[in-house]
Every structure is written in structure tokens, then in C-alpha cells.
């Protein structure tokens, strides 16, 4: 054995954005012949573990949200830990509104600004484009989030949603905004 074992990957199925009350499975993907898998929930003051390669959460609750990582053991050697997975509970707060300025129909080459507004004094907003697994844009901390999209191209066409949350509870998000369809005309 030379050096640490390669790290596994930790995935959330069907998604790491989980509406309250919905099911989710965390799965640690590594060698099938590993002697032992360990899944940790990394919470300051309450770091906890189970010796499994999966965690099934039948009903997502607020206390399930947070950061997770996993490792495996082979012949008494431990792997490097997986990258941390952020499991986010959505629907904790009511949805923000998402709008496009000057319009959601925009010719190529023009600028459009997507604005996410919450009824709460949240300092974090995130924008998702349908079909993408990662956030499309994440602005700095603004109470009213403007997501500038510069020089619109056909690739910017699509359906967008935003979420809002507080930086003091970064894994508890609002419900998604109603979808906003951006059409690049011409």
C-alpha cells in the first residue's frame, strides 16, 4: 500500500436540493470490495457517523440538512475523504419572486438582469437554470439580488428559478420561485 486510498464520491439521489417532506438517498461511491464505509455528518459541535455506504432519508427534515462526507477502509487503510456534499432543505421559507429586466424576451447581444426578491431580509440568493445541476449564478450578498447576464446569446434561453436563504442557516432554503422563461428572440 503506497499512499492513501483514492477518495470516494458522495452523491445525493435524486438531488442535493430536497424539498421538506421528500425522500433523498446519500450514496458513497467507492470500491465494491471495501471492508467498511463511513458516512459523516459534519456539523460543528455534533460531528456524527454511521458505518454505511448510504443514508436513506424517507422524509427530509430541517435537521437532515448540512454537510456530509464519506470514507472507506480497505485492509485497515482508510481512503481520503470524499468532497463534502451540501444537502439542502428547500421549502423552509416561502418562495421569492424572480423577474427579468427590461424583459424576459431579449434580442441577442443585449443585456438582461434577473432580479430575485424575497419578503424576508435574506442575504443570500441563488439562481438555477433548468437542466443544470449547479447554480447558474450566485451573486454577492444583496438583499435584492440582481443577477446580471451580459451579452445575451441563444444559450441563455431557458427556464430559471431562484432561491433565497440566510447565511446564518446556509442549508435551509426557501421554496423555489415560480419559473421564469427567458427567450432570446431573433
Amino acid at each position: 500500500q503506497h499512499g492513501p486510498l483514492p477518495k470516494p464520491s458522495l452523491q445525493a439521489q435524486p438531488s442535493s436540493l430536497v424539498p421538506l417532506g421528500h425522500p433523498v438517498t446519500l450514496r458513497c461511491l467507492g470500491p465494491s470490495d471495501a471492508d467498511l464505509y463511513r458516512l459523516e455528518k459534519v456539523k460543528p459541535g455534533k460531528l456524527i457517523f454511521i458505518d454505511q455506504d448510504f443514508l436513506f432519508i424517507p422524509i427530509m427534515e430541517i435537521n437532515n440538512a448540512g454537510r456530509y462526507r464519506c470514507s472507506y477502509q480497505n485492509e485497515s487503510h482508510w481512503s481520503l475523504p470524499s468532497d463534502q456534499l451540501e444537502l439542502i432543505a428547500t421549502g423552509v421559507y416561502s418562495k421569492p419572486s424572480l423577474s427579468a429586466h427590461p424583459s424576459s424576451a431579449i434580442p441577442p447581444g443585449r443585456d438582461v438582469t434577473l432580479k430575485c426578491q424575497s419578503q424576508y431580509s435574506f442575504d443570500e440568493f441563488v439562481l438555477y437554470k433548468e437542466g443544470d445541476t449547479r447554480p447558474y449564478k450566485r451573486p454577492e450578498k444583496w438583499y435584492r439580488a440582481n443577477f446580471p447576464v451580459i451579452t445575451v446569446t441563444a444559450a441563455h434561453s431557458g427556464t430559471y428559478r431562484c432561491y433565497s436563504f440566510s447565511s446564518s442557516s446556509p442549508y435551509l432554503w426557501s421554496a423555489p420561485s415560480d419559473p421564469l422563461v427567458v427567450v432570446v428572440t431573433g
Epitope: 492513501p4 467498511l36 463511513r38 455528518k41 459534519v42 460543528p44 459541535g45 455534533k46 460531528l47 456524527i48 457517523f49 454511521i50 458505518d51 470514507s71 477502509q73 482508510w78 475523504p81
Partner: antibody, heavy 123, light 112 residues
């Protein structure tokens, strides 16, 4: 109430063997991780080995790997430490300790300790 | 040599405040693992004093408090009493080999 009682310590010659036992009561033994922790005379605490509730997950400190074997019998509410190829530096009080648990999750700290059993390795 | 570093001894007069430090590394305390503290009175087994960096089990006086920052932690004892004279150990977990690690222990002497 939770109780852990160690036994099996004694005087043994270098290269010899000894088997320690820890009798648990007052809790659902098979649900908990348990560890052996030792303390050489006048020295600090050293974690030795841990075992998961079912007995399939075991871990050892580098200093005892290949010489000590941890096991458990949940039907008897008992934890064991088989110590082979003993050395003078294994002389210590050996404690068994329970890891705290909540729902399905285990914690990395020890909430209950036994009173310890003394192992002396000397010729 | 212990993975976590503690001062070998501290002392204080009755009623005073003392702190005991516990320094680790990026693979244990700095990897997100909590720090726990145990008190060992002379001739007895260790007893859990602080868990999860700053939490006290029931029965532990609020004169004992813990904190964690970065790769280190500390235990504070206020209003020192003669019965606090004991050895104190910090404990955490190490990510590299998934082993439990202790500090070398600190002997607290209550003067006078």
C-alpha cells in the same frame, strides 16, 4: 444505570498473552460502539481499539495492530481484547468505554467508562 | 508523544480562573472534528466533562466551559475549588487513519 466492568488483567511475561473482558449492563449493548483505552502508570490516555455494534467494524491503534484483537459477544453483553506478543510498553490500566449514540448516529466521544483493569508485562 | 498538545500542568488559587489549551492539526481538530474533555480525579477512571466542544453533560457545574477555534480548543474553569484538582484530557478524532486521539493531559493544582 450504565455500567462497564473490566476483568482479566494481571502479570504476564513479555511475549505472553492475555484476554481482557468488559461486562456491560444498563443499556442495549449491541447498539453501541465501544473502545478499549489504556493508561500507562503515571502517563496519559491512549486509545487502543474500537468495535462497532455488530462487531464487523473494528479499528486499532498503530501501536497494537497485528498483536491485539477486539471482539464482542452481544448475547453476553461482553467486550473482549485478546492481547498477544505482549511487550513491557503494554503495561497499563485498560479501560473499556462506550461511545455516545443518538438514533442511528454514533459520536466520537466516550460517555461512560469502566473502572479499569491493570495489565503488567514484566519478566 | 500525543497527537494533541496540552500543557503538562496549570495551577491557580481557589476562586481563580484557569484555562487549559489543546492544540491539534488540520487532520483532526482542523478537519471539523469536535473536541471533548475528560476529568480524571486521582485514582479514578476518566469522566466526561465537556462534549462537542462546549456542551456539559448533566451534573457538570457551569464553572466548566469549553471552546474550539481552528485547530485548537480550550477548557476554562472559573471559581476554582479544591475538588477540581485532577488531570484533564482533551480528545478528538483523526481523519487520516480514523483513530481516536488524546492530548497528553494537564495536571491542575489548586494552590493553598
Amino acid at each position: 444505570q450504565v455500567q462497564l466492568v473490566e476483568s482479566g488483567g494481571g502479570l504476564v511475561k513479555p511475549g505472553g498473552s492475555l484476554r481482557l473482558s468488559c461486562a456491560a449492563s444498563g443499556f442495549s449493548f449491541g447498539d453501541y460502539y465501544v473502545s478499549w483505552i489504556r493508561q500507562a502508570p503515571g502517563k496519559g490516555l491512549e486509545w487502543v481499539s474500537a468495535i462497532g455494534g455488530s462487531g464487523s467494524a473494528v479499528q486499532y491503534a498503530e501501536s497494537v495492530k497485528g498483536r491485539f484483537t477486539i471482539s464482542r459477544d452481544n448475547a453476553k453483553n461482553s467486550l473482549y481484547l485478546q492481547m498477544n506478543s505482549l511487550r513491557a510498553e503494554d503495561t497499563a490500566v485498560y479501560y473499556c468505554a462506550r461511545h455516545y449514540r443518538e438514533f442511528r448516529w454514533h459520536y466520537y466521544y466516550f460517555d461512560y467508562w469502566g473502572q479499569g483493569t491493570l495489565v503488567t508485562v514484566s519478566s | 508523544q500525543s497527537v494533541l498538545t496540552q500543557p503538562p500542568s496549570v495551577s491557580g488559587a481557589p476562586g481563580q480562573r484557569v484555562t487549559i489549551s489543546c492544540t491539534g492539526s488540520s487532520s483532526n481538530i482542523g478537519a471539523g472534528y469536535d473536541v471533548h474533555w475528560y476529568q480524571q480525579l486521582p485514582g479514578t477512571a476518566p469522566k466526561l466533562l465537556i462534549y462537542g466542544n462546549s456542551n456539559r453533560p448533566s451534573g457538570v457545574p457551569d464553572r466548566f466551559s469549553g471552546s474550539k477555534s481552528g485547530t485548537s480548543a480550550s477548557l476554562a474553569i472559573t471559581g476554582l475549588q479544591a475538588e477540581d484538582e485532577a488531570d484533564y484530557y482533551c480528545q478528538s478524532h483523526d481523519l487520516g487513519a480514523h483513530v481516536w486521539v488524546f492530548g497528553g493531559g494537564t495536571k491542575l493544582t489548586v494552590l493553598g
